[in-house]
């Protein structure tokens, strides 16, 4: 069991680090950054950089921190109260229907289409027909048919697939 030391057990010069603190549940729940003990009487801190909890809870265990995959960059590290924030590298994006991996953005639009949206970490470039303005979701065009684009940089939290 992690962090079973109470503050009172220690001399002033040996005070436990924040991740070792233990407290009592409030109305049966423990605060963010903690999980409940086996007997339900104590709140035990999550381990910084290893696991976390984001809400008041009665969880037996803190949740494992996400580890950013290769092809992702870490925007913010895991704390005891917040999961790691990962983002696809420049030029790649994560689709909602395949959140476990970053895919390469298309480099441009097919002939007869114009780019109306940049590559972002969560979306491919967006192309529309010049005349009708309807969106295109076809295959990646040949190089001579492309209009190049530059990737965007906004951030998005990553999925829970360490």
């Amino acid at each position: 069991e992690s962090a079973l030391i109470t503050q009172q057990d220690l001399a002033p010069q040996q005070r436990a680090a924040p991740q070792q603190k233990r407290s009592s549940p409030s109305e049966g729940l423990c605060p963010p950054g903690h999980h409940i003990s086996e007997d339900g009487r104590d709140c035990i801190s999550c381990k910084y950089g290893q696991d976390y909890s984001t809400h008041w809870n009665d969880l037996l265990f803190c949740l494992r921190c996400t580890r950013c995959d290769s092809g992702e960059v870490e925007l913010s590290p895991c704390t005891t109260t917040r999961n790691t924030v990962c983002q696809c590298e420049e030029g790649t994006f994560r689709e909602e229907d395949s959140p476990e991996m970053c895919r390469k953005c298309r480099t441009g639009c097919p002939r007869g289409m114009v780019k109306v949206g940049d590559c972002t970490p969560w979306s491919d470039i967006e192309c529309v027909h010049k005349e009708s303005g309807t969106k295109h979701s076809g295959e990646v065009p040949a190089v001579e048919e492309t209009v190049t684009s530059s990737p965007g940089t906004p951030a998005s939290p990553c999925s829970l697939s360490g």
Partner: nanobody, 124 residues
């Protein structure tokens, strides 16, 4: 998604031992807390034991404390339940489950994945 397959059940005499295994495939096993539940004939599902993602923290129901030991081997994607001093009342179908965590009463937190179960019969 995680697929779970239990094994190791069987017929054992009172006082005997069994070791159940739960083999996982699919997404990263080590991301999940794991647990064992059981369902005795004609009864509801009972939370037996649980273990956190790295095996450091464990939970046991009062009915099995001191007799059962839960463990996991993340390198083998396998969860175990060592059952000693078995009693007739331990007779049940044992299920393993994976979830991000489990609440104090045993309720899985987030999406839960379940095995098909393995039958343990304790009888002389």
């Amino acid at each position: 998604e995680v697929q779970l397959l239990e094994s190791g059940g069987g017929l054992v005499q009172p006082g005997g031992s069994l070791r159940l295994s739960c083999a996982a495939s699919g997404r990263a096993f080590s991301n999940y807390a794991m647990s064992w539940f059981r369902q005795a004939p004609g009864k509801g599902l009972e939370f037996v034991s649980a273990i956190n993602w790295n095996g450091e923290n464990r939970y046991y129901a009062d009915s099995v404390k001191g007799r059962f030991t839960i463990s996991r081997d993340n390198s083998k994607n396998t969860l175990y339940l060592q059952m000693n001093s078995l009693r007739a009342e331990d007779t049940a179908v044992y299920y393993c489950a994976a979830a991000l965590s489990f609440r104090l009463g045993g309720e899985p937190y987030g999406d839960a994945y379940w095995g098909q179960g393995t039958l343990v019969t304790v009888s002389s």
